[in-house]
C-alpha cells in the first residue's frame, strides 16, 4: 500500500493543501485513496511512512512575523484531528520572494479509515511547480 | 533492495551529481547499481522509496538571482528524463557562503532498468564533508 | 520493526538531544527501545531506514559563527561511535530568532545493539512544540 | 593499504598538555570522518572523538569534553588531538582510526602517562 500525490493550486481560502493524481504521481491500489483532493485514507490498520514535501516562496515584509509552518495531520473515526508532524522556516528577505522547501517524515499507527493531510498557514505561497510540493504514505 | 551513496567532489562541469560507494555506504544486492558514478539503476520493477538529501553553500551576493534548486530525475528505458522532486532554497546573506541544507524523497514506480539521479543548479556550491550529501533508495 | 518518538527538553548540557515516548509516538516492539532517552537500540541485524527533524531557533547575531549541525550518529557494539547523516542551515537574521527544520534520512546496515543518536550544535536552540523534533526508523 | 601512524605521546604531570598526531596514508584522508580512541591499563577500548571529513563537525566523550580537542589538516594527512589539564585518569595508549563498515584501520598508539 503506497500512494504519492502532486500538489494542485486551489481557489478556496482553506489552509489544507490540495492535491491530485497527476504527473509521475502512485496509487498502488484502492487500499488507499485520495479523498476530496485534500486527504490520503486508508483502508487497513498498520504502520505507515508519511511524508510530505512543501516548497513555499514568502517574503519578511509582506508576510506575517510569525514563520511559515507545514504540519501533516491525523484524522481517525470518532476521534478529534491531531498534529503528527510540523516544519518551520523563516521568511526570507529576498525579492519578490525567496523560496524554500520543507520535508516532513515519519512512522505513525493507523486506523482503518484513518486520514492524513497536510495544513500549511499561508497556502498562497505553496509553489506548485513541477515536483516542488508533493505528498504520500507507504504502508510497512 | 536498498542503497545509500555517499557525494564526491567532480571536476565535472555537469549539473549531476557524483555520487561513491564510500564511507557508511549501502548497497544491499546487484539488483540496484550505481552507474557511472551518477546514477542508481535498479534491476526490478516495482514500487521505491527514493530519497536524497543535498548541503549547500551560498551567498546571495556571489550567486545567481536564482534559488538553488536540487531535482531528483528518473530516466527510464526508451523514455526521457523526466523529473520526480525538486526542492529549492533561496541563497544566504551570510559571508563568505551560508550552509543549507535540502531533503527530498518520494514513492515511486520504476521499471527494470530505470535510473535515478541528482541534478543541482551549482555543482560547486555542495557540501561533501562526512554526511552532508547523499542518495538513496529502498524497494517497497 | 519500527520507531518513532518526540523531543523532550532537556537541562542536561549534553549536545545529544533528548527523546520520549509520548504524544504519537510509534514503538512496534521490544526488538527496537529507547535506551537513557537519547537513543535507539535495535535487537536484530538488518537495513534500516533511519530519519531524525529537527526544528530550531536562532539569531544570526546570537550564535557562533558556525552554522546549526544536526547529526545523526551510530554506536555499535565494540565499536566507536560515527557520524552517518549532518545537515547544516546557517543562522537567521530574523529577531528574536528565526525558525528552520532540518530532515535527515537514509538507508543503513545495524548490528545487534547497535544504537542511534542526534547530536546538534546547540540543544538550547531546538523547538519542543508538538511536531518539530522527532525521531524514528523502520526495518526493511 | 591503510596506513595511521601516532606520535605525541609521553610523561606529563597531571594538569599539564600534550599534542597528539597522526600521520596518515593509502587513502584519501580529506574524505573520511577520523577518531581517536584509547585503552586505559587493564581496561576496554573508549571512544574519545570523532571529526567529519571538512573539520566542520567535532564529537567528544563525556571524560574529555572542554579539556580535549580534535583537529586536522588535510593538507597534511594528518589528525590532531590537543589534551589539556591532563588527569590521571587519561593515562592510556592513544589510537586514531579510520572507520569502516565491517571493520576499523588502526594506527600502533601512542602512550599517553600522567603522574607526578
Known amino acids: 500500500i503506497a500512494a504519492h500525490v502532486i500538489s494542485e493550486a486551489s481557489s478556496k481560502t482553506t489552509s489544507v493543501l490540495q492535491w491530485a493524481e497527476k504527473g509521475y504521481y502512485t496509487m498502488s491500489n484502492n487500499l488507499v485513496t485520495l479523498e476530496n483532493g485534500k486527504q490520503l485514507t486508508v483502508k487497513r490498520q498498520g504502520l505507515y511512512y508519511i511524508y510530505a514535501q512543501v516548497t513555499f516562496c514568502s517574503n519578511r515584509e509582506a508576510s506575517s512575523q510569525a514563520p511559515f509552518i507545514a504540519s501533516l495531520c491525523l484524522k481517525s473515526p470518532g476521534r478529534f484531528e491531531r498534529i503528527l508532524l510540523r516544519a518551520a522556516n523563516t521568511h526570507s528577505s529576498a525579492k519578490p520572494c525567496g523560496q524554500q522547501s520543507i520535508h516532513l517524515g515519519g512512522v505513525f499507527e493507523l486506523q482503518p479509515g484513518a486520514s492524513v493531510f497536510v495544513n500549511v498557514t499561508d497556502p498562497s505561497q505553496v509553489s506548485h511547480g513541477t515536483g516542488f510540493t508533493s505528498f504520500g504514505l507507504l504502508k510497512l | 533492495i536498498a542503497a545509500h551513496v555517499i557525494s564526491e567532489a567532480s571536476s565535472k562541469t555537469t549539473s549531476v551529481l557524483q555520487w561513491a560507494e564510500k564511507g557508511y555506504y549501502t548497497m544491499s544486492n546487484n539488483l540496484v547499481t550505481l552507474e557511472n558514478g551518477k546514477q542508481l539503476t535498479v534491476k526490478r520493477q516495482g514500487l521505491y522509496y527514493i530519497y536524497a538529501q543535498v548541503t549547500f553553500c551560498s551567498n546571495r551576493e556571489a550567486s545567481s538571482q536564482a534559488p538553488f534548486i536540487a531535482s531528483l530525475c528518473l530516466k527510464s528505458p526508451g523514455r526521457f528524463e523526466r523529473i520526480l522532486l525538486r526542492a529549492a532554497n533561496t541563497h544566504s546573506s551570510a559571508k563568505p557562503c551560508g550552509q543549507q541544507s535540502i531533503h527530498l524523497g518520494g514513492v515511486f514506480e520504476l521499471q527494470p532498468g530505470a535510473s535515478v539521479f541528482v541534478n543541482v543548479t551549482d555543482p560547486s556550491q555542495v557540501s561533501h564533508g562526512t554526511g552532508f550529501t547523499s542518495f538513496g533508495l529502498l524497494k517497497l | 520493526i519500527a520507531a518513532h518518538v518526540i523531543s523532550e527538553a532537556s537541562s542536561k548540557t549534553t549536545s545529544v538531544l533528548q527523546w520520549a515516548e509520548k504524544g504519537y509516538y510509534t514503538m512496534s516492539n521490544n526488538l527496537v527501545t529507547l535506551e537513557n532517552g537519547k537513543q535507539l537500540t535495535v535487537k536484530r541485524q538488518g537495513l534500516y531506514y533511519i530519519y531524525a527533524q529537527v526544528t530550531f531557533c536562532s539569531n544570526r547575531e546570537a550564535s557562533s559563527q558556525a552554522p546549526f549541525i544536526a547529526s545523526l550518529c551510530l554506536k555499535s557494539p565494540g565499536r566507536f561511535e560515527r557520524i552517518l547523516l549532518r545537515a547544516a542551515n546557517t543562522h537567521s537574521s530574523a529577531k528574536p530568532c528565526g525558525q528552520q527544520s532540518i530532515h535527515l534520512g537514509g538507508v543503513f546496515e545495524l548490528q545487534p545493539g547497535a544504537s542511534v543518536f542526534v547530536n546538534v550544535t546547540d540543544p538550547s536552540q531546538v523547538s519542543h512544540g508538538t511536531g518539530f523534533t522527532s525521531f524514528g526508523l523502520l526495518k526493511l | 593499504e591503510v596506513q595511521l601512524l601516532e606520535s605525541g605521546g609521553g610523561l606529563v604531570q597531571p594538569g599539564g598538555s600534550l599534542r597528539l598526531s597522526c600521520a596518515a596514508s593509502?587513502?584519501?584522508?580529506?574524505?573520511?570522518?577520523m577518531v581517536w580512541v584509547r585503552q586505559a591499563p587493564g581496561k576496554g577500548l573508549e571512544w574519545v572523538s570523532s571529526i567529519t571529513s571538512d573539520g566542520l563537525s567535532t564529537y567528544y566523550a563525556d571524560s574529555v569534553k572542554g579539556r580535549f580537542t580534535i583537529s586536522r589538516d588535510n593538507s597534511k594527512n594528518t589528525l590532531y588531538l590537543q589534551m589539556n589539564s591532563l588527569r590521571a585518569e587519561d593515562t592510556a595508549v592513544y589510537y586514531c582510526?579510520?572507520?569502516?563498515?565491517?571493520?576499523?584501520?588502526w594506527g600502533q598508539g601512542t602512550l599517553v602517562t600522567v603522574s607526578s
Open positions: 593509502g587513502f584519501t584522508f580529506g574524505e573520511y570522518e
Open positions: 582510526a579510520k572507520p569502516g563498515i565491517r571493520f576499523d584501520y
